[in-house]
Interface confidence: low
């Protein structure tokens, strides 16, 4: 810290502000009767250079003039841009132990003269806004630089406003605080910016504009829409605008869309009819304004109006599927399933479904409404049945969709051939097949149906299905497909009055199972051992199990175990083996195999076959 220069003064020539590349002379003078006591000749004045409070140089060798013990002049060169602090200190050379005493200091600013301001741009936001201009100041001057914005217009009127740039703030914009009104629409204005600092001054080229060039209308406000006769596709958009607006741009889109519908409207006077809206769809509407057909600038977009168009009656066709199950010799249970309409087909909130089951000869008709996407009824096994379902919203119902109830897997000749299921990636499976070889009626369509092979899945979960045209022999199934889960996949071929199906298991990704089957019992019958097991818990299967392996070896033997491989069947939980020696103790265990590999072994069981009873 420098104590208000009690001991002396420091001066700079030619000035404390110099252009980049210039030299300066700094003189340090002691006040009378100040200095080292007793020995004025021992007074040594030193000059220290600080940059950002850090001592960077002792200018002892730069002394150009010296009045011993009274004053010294130092020349400084190669000063960098910005502020540099010089501190003069008094060093009493006869007292080595005392540090130099500060005398006084000075800051020298190095900078450049301002460049002419460029790219002046002026804007007035709205008819009642004020004129604000911005410009490019050019290179940083590293000095406090004053800017004057001057606006000249009709009636010999000029207004000006000032601001400054320094190392803390940048001045490249000024709001003049004056408003240009529409009655000056034909007038021309000239604006210029002048920059001045301690090293020089410069002026921009004059910039000329008219009212229309610079006034940007305020965005429209109070946007609303009226739907004609509660139509879901036609509406009148209304809004408020500034009085001088002659051109509007409208943009609107469904909320989940990525592209806008754009409309230009001339002399709309705050109203425009839209005729191509989608019913029961959340829309976003925005409007922009312009004061002149050819010149001027568009306003910012208005705030969004978000609203939903009204409902209209559904137009889609429901995708129906069903399951048949015989209950006893004269009754069957029919479970109908259907997929929800997509929003563009539903055109509103579906309130319920109308379901009809009808015997073709019209002897019996069952009707019901449900809010669910499935319906189950018990009907006689006799007769030919047809089902229909339609969807209803607040405006009406869709056309009913019909399906004939046939025995889905009843006709072997209609069974598709060479059905295969290949995992494509983590969440889908490619199913391919060949058409039935000797179908006595034409295939009208294929249905690919799938469900997870987990306990209770038939009763708990509805099936998933895809309708495939008769000339296609493949389907990529992805709905509700998860990795490491085995699915039963059926391909149905349907004709007008018959059905045939083939079944296969498939998974989208597989790993070796977590564990092997658990052997629950080993029993001996007629020289054969029956191994019984419980299946691997569903979450531990990790894909479709292809087969089980039963291993056995003599207890304490180091030989490789023997094994028997069984094709996996869900219904099977025991298997005979017959090649074991009587009265030898064996160790048995099981593993499971998926396409990814073999599980670790399950539990071990020991057994000693008794052989023939004497």
């Amino acid at each position: 810290n420098i104590d208000v220069c009690k001991l002396g003064t420091v001066t700079v020539q030619p000035a404390p502000v110099i252009p980049l590349g210039s030299a300066a002379n700094i003189s340090c003078s002691l006040n009378p009767k100040q200095g080292c006591s007793h020995y004025p000749s021992s007074n040594e004045l030193i000059l220290l250079k600080f940059v950002n409070d850090v001592l960077v140089e002792n200018l002892h060798g730069k002394k150009v003039h010296d009045h011993t013990g009274h004053s010294s002049t130092f020349q400084v060169t190669n000063l960098s841009l910005g502020m540099t602090l010089f501190v003069c200190k008094l060093n009493c050379s006869n007292s080595q132990k005392k540090p130099p005493v500060p005398v006084c200091g000075v800051e020298i600013s190095v900078g450049v003269a301002p460049e002419p301001p460029q790219n002046i741009s002026c804007v007035q936001e709205g008819e009642n806004g004020t004129v604000a201009c911005s410009w490019n100041s050019g290179k940083v001057t590293y000095l406090k630089t004053n800017y004057t914005l001057q606006l000249s217009g009709p009636n010999n009127l000029t207004c000006q406003k000032q601001c400054f740039s320094d190392n803390r703030q940048n001045c490249n914009r000024l709001d003049l605080g004056i408003n240009l009104s529409p009655d000056l629409a034909e007038s021309r204005f000239i604006v210029r910016v002048t920059a001045i600092n301690d090293l020089g001054n410069s002026s921009s080229l004059p910039h000329t504009f008219t009212f229309l060039d610079i006034v940007i209308p305020l965005p429209p406000w109070d946007i609303r829409i009226n739907f004609l006769n509660a139509s879901g596709s036609r509406g009148t958009l209304q809004w408020e605008d500034e009085g001088q607006v002659v051109l509007n741009q409208l943009r609107y889109q469904p909320l989940n869309s990525t592209s806008w519908n754009m409309v230009n409207a001339t002399n709309a006077k705050g109203k425009y009819d839209l005729r191509d809206l989608r019913p029961f769809t959340e829309y976003e509407f925005q409007i922009s304004s312009k004061l002149h057909l050819s010149g001027g600038s568009w306003s910012n977009w208005s705030e969004s109006l978000r609203t939903r168009t009204p409902e209209e009656e559904p137009v889609g066709i429901l995708d129906i599927w069903y399951m048949k199950q015989d209950i006893d010799y004269d009754r069957q249970q029919i479970s109908l399933f259907w997929k929800s309409l997509n929003p563009s087909e539903a055109r509103g909130k579906i309130l319920h479904y109308q379901v009809t089951l009808q015997e073709v000869t019209k002897k019996t008709t069952l009707q019901n409404t449900t809010r669910h996407t499935s319906w189950t009824r018990v009907i006689p096994r006799t007769g030919a049945w047809t089902a229909s379902v339609s969807a209803a919203n607040s405006k009406g119902a869709s056309a009913p969709t019909h399906i004939n109830i046939v025995d889905l897997c009843g006709t072997g000749l209609l069974a598709p051939h060479q059905v295969s299921a290949k995992s494509e990636n983590m969440d889908n499976i490619l199913v391919t097949w060949q058409p039935p070889k000797k179908a006595d009626s034409a295939v009208r369509e294929y249905i690919v149906e799938w469900r997870a092979l987990q306990p209770g899945s038939i009763t708990k979960f509805p099936p998933h299905w895809l309708r495939i045209p008769p000339d296609n022999m493949s389907a990529l199934i992805s709905e509700n497909i998860k990795p490491y889960i085995c699915y039963e996949i059926r391909v149905h071929a349907l004709s007008e009055s018959q059905g045939g199906c083939s079944s296969i298991r498939g998974d989208s990704k597989h790993k070796a199972p977590v564990s092997g089957p658990h052997i629950t019992a080993i029993t001996e019958k007629k020289e054969r051992l029956f191994i019984s097991w419980t299946h691997i818990p569903f979450p531990e299967q990790r894909g479709c199990i292809l087969h089980y392996r039963i291993y056995w070896k003599e207890r304490d033997s180091t030989a490789q175990p023997e094994l028997c491989e069984i094709q996996y069947r869900r219904s099977q939980n025991s298997h005979p083996i017959s090649s074991l020696q009587p009265r030898v103790t064996y160790v048995l265990w099981m593993t499971a195999v998926t396409a990814a590999g073999e599980s670790p072994q399950g539990n071990e069981r020991e057994f000693c076959p008794q052989g023939k009873a004497n």
Partner: nanobody, 129 residues
Framework: QVQLQESGGGLVQPGGSLRLSCAAS????????MAWFRQAPGTEREFVAG?????????FYDNSVMGRFTISRDSAKNTMWLQINNLKPEDTAVYYC?????????????????????WGQGTQVTVSS
């Protein structure tokens, strides 16, 4: 992911003191420039104090706070502090911690917002009786 988290702000009477902290995570800033900026309502964010990050870790202060504010840091804890004494009503602002990924030695650069690559969310300091 680099994060700067300020804390220590609050309501204090004129003449009082506060100690603001800035904890850096996701990167070590011990050798790089760090700074405190503040932004009062309706004004631009302004430089308050900074550390150059060069060998001696030079401290920078805006003249308006010189002598009242002290900036420091603990490199091991990756933390920077701003001790504020003799608070005035005009010190009321949101105080932001900023960090660069380079050393800053130019007086002209240390106080520019564009110098800094990472910013905290800010802590409110209100000076009122």
């Amino acid at each position: 992911q680099v994060q700067l988290q300020e804390s220590g702000g609050g309501l204090v009477q004129p003449g009082g003191s506060l100690r603001l902290s800035c904890a850096a995570s996701g990167r070590t800033f011990s050798n790089y420039a760090m700074a405190w900026f503040r932004q009062a309502p309706g004004t631009e964010r302004e430089f308050v104090a900074g550390l150059s990050g060069s060998g001696g870790d030079t401290a920078f202060y805006d003249n308006s706070v010189m002598g009242r504010f002290t900036i420091s840091r603990d490199s091991a804890k990756n933390t920077m502090w701003l001790q504020i004494n003799n608070l005035k009503p005009e010190d009321t602002a949101v105080y932001y911690c900023a960090a660069a990924t380079h050393v800053v030695v130019s007086y002209g650069l240390v106080r520019r917002r564009g110098t800094y690559d990472y910013w905290g969310q800010g802590t409110q300091v209100t000076v009122s009786s």
